[in-house]
């Protein structure tokens, strides 16, 4: 799995609702895959991590300046939906066939 | 400023383009303000953070799972332009007034 | 090597017409603002007008003496500016360089040549 | 319009010693942080030629006894150690807005 060391990349996260407490009102699925973006933004930085010019910025004056300013980050930089089960207001079982921005679809130097 | 204690915001951040060695291109402005977002992305995360549902989810899995997964990140979420005058390849000063993505509008948890 | 060369000037009459061009070498052409700057005798240096690129339109400004009177063109084609000069004055004789550049600066300059309005 | 001003109209200095033209704009010319600045070399019957950009970067092959300083309204030519090829009217001029303008010029002459 990737860590601290390794160059950002999306890993899996399996969340189950039961645990984030949103088995309340989502009745399925019971888990999902989330994914997470991992690692480091390393200089220098790839194109596969698509890096804004800011974050270009950034990770070169971290370069110069490492204890004054930090690397960019490993985020979300795209998302997918999932579809759920959920009950409604009055209780009732409804499909959300896309439920938005539930997913990681890629991660990125931000 | 804002350390790793504070929430996620917007924080000062000049860079001297001789700094990052891109004084080789860009003629002017010898520095600029980047801005750096900075802070922790700690539940329950504000409205201003503008969180993604996957940041909330990854959030509440950190607090069930604090050595498994990581909290959302405090990143860049808006990017705006700045202007900068630049040698073409027939070492012509031309101005560019949209160069975009080098300083921080807004600062999010993603 | 840059090279901006203009077309011949010469004597024309206050009310008269006359069209200057200027053919241009050594660079992209289509990549620069071309510009007129004007000198009369023995004076400093005037701003007449500029003409931009295909993808600003090629928008064109003018100084306000000239507005109205002057046309500035370009034909990319033929890597060429043009300057047409209608209602000619007396106050309009000098020197017209043709010059190339960016949104900055005046990079590329011509010899010039020297327009005369007199009766 | 943005009026910009040189002093002095003409300057005689000996060879070998500091030459220094001044250039006032009416309003700031300085934007994002850059100065719309720039000043030009005239040699007699010849066309202008770009000396200064950005009120203090050398243009392309010119001498480093040139420089330029300033920013906002107040700006300064300096020719560190005149040579007599320089014997020129020279200009200012900012890009600011148009109308591009120029100042009247200064002659420089030696002594």
């Known amino acids: 799995s990737a860590g601290a060391g390794s160059h950002c990349q999306k890993t899996s996260l399996r969340v189950n609702f039961e645990d984030i407490g949103w088995d309340s009102w989502i009745i399925a699925p019971k888990e999902y895959e989330a994914y997470e973006c991992k690692g480091g933004c390393f200089f220098p930085l790839a194109d596969d991590v698509t890096p804004t010019k800011h974050a270009i910025v950034q990770t070169l004056v971290h370069l110069k300046f490492p204890t004054k300013v930090g690397k960019a980050c490993c985020v979300p930089t795209k998302l997918s939906p999932i579809s759920v089960l959920y009950k409604d207001d009055m209780g009732v079982p409804t499909l959300k066939y896309h439920y938005e921005g539930m997913s990681v679809a890629e991660c990125g130097c931000r | 400023s804002a350390g790793a204690g504070s929430h996620c915001q917007k924080t000062s951040l000049r860079v001297n383009f001789e700094d990052i060695g891109w004084d080789s291109w860009i003629i002017a402005p010898k520095e600029y303000e980047a801005y750096e977002c900075k802070g922790g992305c700690f539940f329950p995360l504000a409205d201003d953070v503008t969180p993604t549902k996957h940041a909330i989810v990854q959030t509440l899995v950190h607090l069930k799972f604090p050595t498994k997964v990581g909290k959302a990140c405090c990143v860049p979420t808006k990017l705006s332009p700045i202007s900068v005058l630049y040698k073409d390849d027939m070492g012509v000063p031309t101005l560019k007034y949209h160069y975009e993505g080098m300083s921080v509008a807004e600062c999010g948890c993603r | 090597e840059v090279q901006l060369v203009e077309s011949r000037g010469g004597l024309v009459q206050p009310g008269g017409s006359m069209r200057l061009s200027c053919a241009a070498s050594?660079?992209?052409?289509?990549?620069?603002?071309m510009n007129w700057v004007r000198q009369a005798p023995g004076k400093g240096l005037e701003w007449v007008a500029h003409i931009r690129l295909k993808s600003d339109n090629y928008a064109t400004h003018y100084a306000e003496s000239v507005r109205g009177r002057f046309t500035i063109s370009r034909d990319d084609s033929k890597s060429s500016v043009y300057l047409q000069m209608n209602s000619l004055k007396t106050e309009d004789t000098g020197i017209y360089y043709c010059?190339?550049?960016?949104?900055?600066?005046?990079?590329?300059w011509g010899q010039g040549t020297l327009v005369t309005v007199s009766s | 319009d943005i009026v910009m001003t040189q002093s002095p109209d003409s300057l005689a200095v000996s060879l070998g010693e500091r030459a220094t033209i001044n250039c006032r704009a009416s309003?700031?010319?300085?934007?994002?942080?850059?100065?719309?600045m720039n000043w030009y070399q005239q040699k007699p019957g010849q066309p202008p030629k770009l000396l200064i950009y950005a009120a203090s970067n050398q243009g392309s092959g010119v001498p480093d006894r040139f420089s330029g300083s300033g920013s906002g309204t107040d700006f300064t030519l300096t020719i560190s150690s005149l040579q007599a090829e320089d014997v020129a009217v020279y200009y200012c001029q900012q890009s600011k807005e148009v109308p591009w303008t120029f100042g009247q010029g200064t002659k420089l002459e030696i002594k």
């Open positions: 309003e700031s010319v300085d934007n994002y942080g850059i100065s719309f």
């Open positions: 050594g660079f992209t052409f289509s990549n620069y603002w």
């Open positions: 010059t190339g550049g960016s949104n900055y600066v005046f990079a590329f």
